[in-house]
């Protein structure tokens, strides 16, 4: 059976996973005033043949999956990466101790796909 | 995914690798008239701390790298994925044996980054 060969079969397909990031855990609490943390999320899972519609695969990812099937030693599977990212607003101290409100782009994973 | 592979090796950093894809190797030679193949390329390599400027890392990838350092069992490293993709034009037979010239988006990897 395929499971005799491919340990990745036991893995789930590429999807978004929930992840809350505490700025204190990152050691950023001294310069970030608010928020205390945020729902960053992350992408993980397999991008295996066949890539279905849920996987938001690019044409290149579809081609790479086929090449991987023929040459697994040489070409990896496409990887599970964010396809949609959101910004968050952060209140922080700058180098001169001024309080700044800034929007940081690409901080929150909203969707994942095979790339 | 990285877990499919031997983590004891010193891996190279995330970068673009050259890959020529032959449509005959994919079994598509009966419907694709031209080209016979194309330089698809692919992304591979490590997205390890610290992520340098060459790695085109998003803010989320930087955060995820730090969380991975603290919780490697739970949160993977960001993955090495295409950041710039190009189209190619393909001449092919459709289902009614008409010859069609179509531009296929996101077929060629031009640049890679950590996502």
């Amino acid at each position: 059976s395929a499971s005799d060969y491919n340990s990745s079969e036991l893995k789930t397909a590429c999807r978004k996973h929930e992840l809350y990031v505490s700025f204190q855990d990152l050691g950023w609490q001294d310069w970030i005033i608010a928020p205390k943390g945020y729902a960053a999320n992350y992408c993980d899972g397999e991008c295996s043949f066949p890539l279905n519609a849920h996987m938001n695969a690019t044409n290149h990812a579809i081609v790479q999956t086929l090449v991987h099937l023929m040459n697994p030693e040489y070409v990896p599977k496409p990887c599970c990466a964010p396809t949609k990212l959101n910004a968050i607003s952060v209140l922080y101290f700058d180098d001169n101790s001024n309080v700044i409100l800034k929007k940081y782009r690409n901080m929150v994973v909203r969707a994942c796909g095979c790339h | 995914s990285a877990s499919d592979y031997n983590s004891s090796e010193l891996k190279t950093a995330c970068r673009k690798h050259e890959l020529y894809v032959s449509f005959q190797d994919l079994g598509w030679q009966d419907w694709i008239i031209a080209p016979k193949g194309y330089a698809a390329n692919y992304c591979d390599g490590e997205c390890s701390f610290p992520l340098n400027a060459h790695m085109n890392a998003t803010n989320h990838a930087i955060v995820q790298t730090l969380v991975h350092l603290m919780n490697p069992e739970y949160v993977p490293k960001p993955c090495c994925a295409p950041t710039k993709l190009n189209a190619i034009s393909v001449l092919y037979f459709d289902d009614n044996s008409n010859v069609i010239l179509k531009k296929y988006r996101n077929m060629v990897v031009r640049a890679c980054g950590c996502h």
């Epitope: 023929m70 040489y74 990896p76 | 079994g27």
Partner: antibody, heavy 118, light 107 residues
Framework: QVHLVQSGAEVKKPGASVKVSCKTS????????IHWVRQAPGQGLEWMGW????????EYSEKFQGRVTITRDTSASTVYMDLSSLRSGDTAVYYC???????????WGQGTLVTVSS | EIVMTQSPATLSVSPGERATLSCRAS??????LAWYQHQPGQAPRLLIY???TRATGFPPRFSGSGSGTDFTLTINSLQSEDFAVYYC?????????FGPGTKLDIT
């Protein structure tokens, strides 16, 4: 001339480990993958795992997962296959074989007989 | 995964005769099929690749044909050194599983 030369026959006790080497010559070591295939007495050919000699990436058959480790020494153009927790069913001839991109196994080692017996 | 079957399991033929060995894949493997010759006490040798291309060192009496799912290895005018086990293997879709083999025996 391409050559894959394996280490000699081994006799091991159940529970022990064995490390078989495959020394290559006659081609650029890092541009090919090396696979390990075994044949137990009276049986067919059974794939165990591979290593990309260029980047060290490996994949193993689920059947051997956790017991087999494939490594390489690029300076010596040699690949090693380590099989642990040996049992009598592991008595077999072990082969290394070379595979290029899009190709079959075009060159094989001569085989190493591993006998597991108490 | 793609399952490979070979028939017959054993084929008994006299020297000088022709042997025809069959290999079938459970789904199309295009022309990405190889045949290996395996003689007792030796390593397997690549005999045919790409379904029909003869590997270096094998004479023209060996020929391969087929594509998709059905493949044939033909050995004309059998010589004593041809009696061995022959394995087919697809290398189109990972995992590249070997067929169970056909043993070619002297009648």
């Amino acid at each position: 001339q391409v050559h894959l030369v394996q280490s000699g026959a081994e006799v091991k006790k159940p529970g022990a480990s064995v490390k078989v080497s495959c020394k290559t010559s006659g081609y650029t070591f890092t541009t090919y993958a090396i696979h390990w295939v075994r044949q137990a007495p009276g049986q067919g050919l059974e794939w165990m795992g591979w290593i990309n000699a260029g980047n060290g990436r490996t994949e193993y058959s689920e059947k051997f997962q956790g017991r087999v480790t494939i490594t390489r020494d690029t300076s010596a153009s040699t690949v090693y296959m380590d099989l642990s927790s040996l049992r009598s069913g592991d008595t077999a001839v072990y082969y290394c074989a070379r595979r290029g991109f899009g190709e079959p196994f075009d060159q094989w080692g001569q085989g190493t007989l591993v006998t597991v017996s108490s | 995964e793609i399952v490979m079957t070979q028939s017959p399991a054993t084929l008994s033929v006299s020297p000088g005769e022709r042997a025809t060995l069959s290999c079938r894949a459970s789904q199309s493997v295009s022309s990405n099929l190889a045949w290996y010759q395996h003689q007792p006490g030796q390593a397997p040798r690549l005999l045919i690749y790409g379904a029909s291309t003869r590997a270096t060192g094998f004479p023209p009496r060996f020929s391969g044909s087929g594509s998709g799912t059905d493949f044939t290895l033909t050995i004309n005018s059998l010589q004593s050194e041809d009696f061995a086990v022959y394995y087919c293997q697809q290398y189109n879709n990972w995992p590249f599983i070997f067929g169970p083999g056909t043993k070619l025996d002297i009648t």
